[in-house]
Interface confidence: low
C-alpha cells in the first residue's frame, strides 16, 4: 500500500484591511489535489497573538477566515490540510503545517503611547474615551483616535476631541449605529516634531462598558406591620428593565442596616416598631444577561422617611 499524503495549503497570509485589528487570514488549495476530486478537503487553522498561551482553532472548508487581534502584539498562524477518513478509506490524513506571521512595525518607544485609556458607554447611548499623554512627551505631541466596528466601510477618526492645554486627551463619539454586541476597535496614534510616537490598540464591546443613569422615583409602601416595600423606576434611556441589576443601601436610624443586590425594581424590608428613620439609595448596573461586565451607576438621590411611628404609616414620597 502506498501512503496517502497531501500538501499544505498554498499562499497562506494574514491581510490587514485597515480595520485596526480585524484581520483576514487567507490561503489557496494545496497542490496536487487531483486524486481527491470527489472529496471535500478541510483545513485546520490555528492562530493567536504572539505571547498567548492558547491557540484558537477553526476547522473550515473555506479559503479564508476573519477575526480580531491585538495589534499591540504580533500575530502567528498556521494551517494544514485535512483529508477526512472517508477520502482515504482509513484514518484522517493531515498535511504538514504552513505558517505565517504579521505585526505592525512599532514606531517610538513604549512610554510615548497614551496612558490610562478609559472608555465608558454612558447609559448605552454616548461613548466617551479619555487618556493621558505618554510619559515624557513634549507639549507639541498630539494624539489622534481612530475607530472601526463591523458595519463601517472604513476606520473613522474622532471628530470631537476633548482637549487640555491644546492637546487631545479624549474623544466624544457621535451616535454609533448598530455598534453593540460586536468588537469595537480603537487605535490612538500620535505625532510630534521631535520624536516618533508609539500607537496603541484597544478592543472591547460597548455593552460591557455601560454606565447607566441612576434609578429614579424612589418610594416606600407599607406591606404589613413589619414589612416595607421599597420601589424605584428604571432610569430613562434605551436600556430595557430586564438588563438591570440593582444595589440598595438602606440606613435605619443612622446605622447601615442592609446592602443588597436585586434584579427587580422592588425590595421588601423587615422593620421593627422602634424604627424612627429609614433612608435608602439605589444604583444600577447592566446584568449578565445583557453584558459580560459593566460599571455601576452613581447612587440615586436619597429617599428618607422620618416620623414618630413608622409602623402605622403608608410611606409614599
Amino acid at each position: 500500500d502506498t501512503e496517502i499524503k497531501v500538501n499544505p495549503p498554498q499562499d497562506f497570509e494574514i491581510v490587514d484591511p485597515g480595520y485596526l485589528g480585524y484581520l483576514y487570514l487567507q490561503w489557496q488549495p494545496p497542490l496536487s489535489l487531483d486524486h481527491f476530486k470527489e472529496c471535500t478537503v478541510e483545513y485546520e487553522l490555528k492562530y493567536r497573538n504572539i505571547g498567548s498561551e492558547t491557540w484558537k482553532t477553526i476547522i473550515t472548508k473555506n479559503l479564508h477566515y476573519k477575526d480580531g487581534f491585538d495589534l499591540n502584539k504580533g500575530i502567528e498562524a498556521k494551517i494544514h490540510t485535512l483529508l477526512p477518513w472517508q477520502c482515504t478509506n482509513g484514518s484522517e490524513v493531515q498535511s504538514s503545517w504552513a505558517e505565517t506571521t504579521y505585526w505592525i512595525s512599532p514606531q517610538g518607544i513604549p512610554e510615548t503611547k497614551v496612558q490610562d485609556m478609559d472608555c465608558v458607554y454612558y447609559n448605552w447611548q454616548y461613548l466617551l474615551c479619555s487618556w493621558k499623554p505618554g510619559i515624557g512627551v513634549l507639549l507639541d505631541t498630539n494624539y489622534n483616535l481612530f475607530y472601526w466596528y463591523e458595519g463601517l466601510d472604513h476606520a473613522l477618526q474622532c471628530v470631537d476631541y476633548i482637549k487640555a492645554d491644546g492637546q487631545n486627551i479624549g474623544c466624544r463619539f457621535p451616535y454609533l449605529e448598530a455598534s453593540d454586541y460586536k468588537d469595537f476597535y480603537i487605535c490612538v496614534n500620535g505625532s510630534s516634531e521631535n520624536k516618533p510616537i508609539r500607537s496603541s490598540y484597544f478592543t472591547f464591546q460597548l455593552q460591557n462598558i455601560v454606565k447607566p443613569l441612576p434609578p429614579v422615583y424612589l418610594t416606600f409602601t407599607r406591606e404589613s406591620s413589619c414589612e416595607i416595600k421599597l420601589k424605584w423606576s428604571i432610569p430613562l434611556g434605551p436600556i430595557p428593565a430586564r438588563c438591570f441589576d440593582y444595589e440598595i443601601e438602606i440606613r435605619e436610624d443612622d446605622t447601615t442596616l442592609v446592602t443588597a443586590t436585586v434584579e427587580n425594581e422592588t425590595y421588601t424590608l423587615k422593620t421593627t416598631n422602634e424604627t424612627r428613620q429609614l433612608c435608602f439609595v439605589v444604583r444600577s448596573k447592566v446584568n449578565i444577561y445583557c453584558s459580560d461586565d459593566g460599571i455601576w451607576s452613581e447612587w440615586s438621590d436619597k429617599q428618607c422617611w422620618e416620623g414618630e411611628d413608622l409602623s402605622k404609616k403608608t410611606l409614599l414620597r
Partner: nanobody, 128 residues
Framework: DVQLVESGGGLVQPGGSLRLSCEAS????????IGWFRQAPGKEREGVSC????????VYTDSVKGRFRISRGTAKNTVYLQMSALKPEDTAVYYC?????????????????????WGQGTQVTVSS
Amino acid sequence: DVQLVESGGGLVQPGGSLRLSCEASGFASDDYIIGWFRQAPGKEREGVSCISSRYANTVYTDSVKGRFRISRGTAKNTVYLQMSALKPEDTAVYYCAMDSRRVTCPEISTMHRNFDSWGQGTQVTVSS
C-alpha cells in the same frame, strides 16, 4: 425555535478518538455560547466544555483538559468536540446546548445554569 442536533457518537476502544458535531439552527443572534455536557448512567449531567461564538473563548472541565478540544466551524453554527485518549469513564450521553443570552463562557462549575436550548444527545461508549 432553536434546534440543536448532535452527531458523531459511537463505540470506541480505550485510547481511541471521536469527533462530535453540534449543528444549531433557528436562531438570529450572532452572540451566544455553545456547551457540551455529558450524563453517565446514574450520574448527574456535567459540563464538559464551552465555546463562545464571538470570542472563541473556551473552557474545559479538569478531567478532559488536554484530551478534548472544542472548536467551531466557519459558519459558526457548527461546533465540534474532538475527543482523544478516550477512557471508559468518558462513557455517557453527550448533549450540546446553547445560551443565546451570553457572549462568553462562564466557569465550568456554573455552566449548567446558563443554557436555554438543548439537543437530544448522542451516545459515546468507550469499551474494549
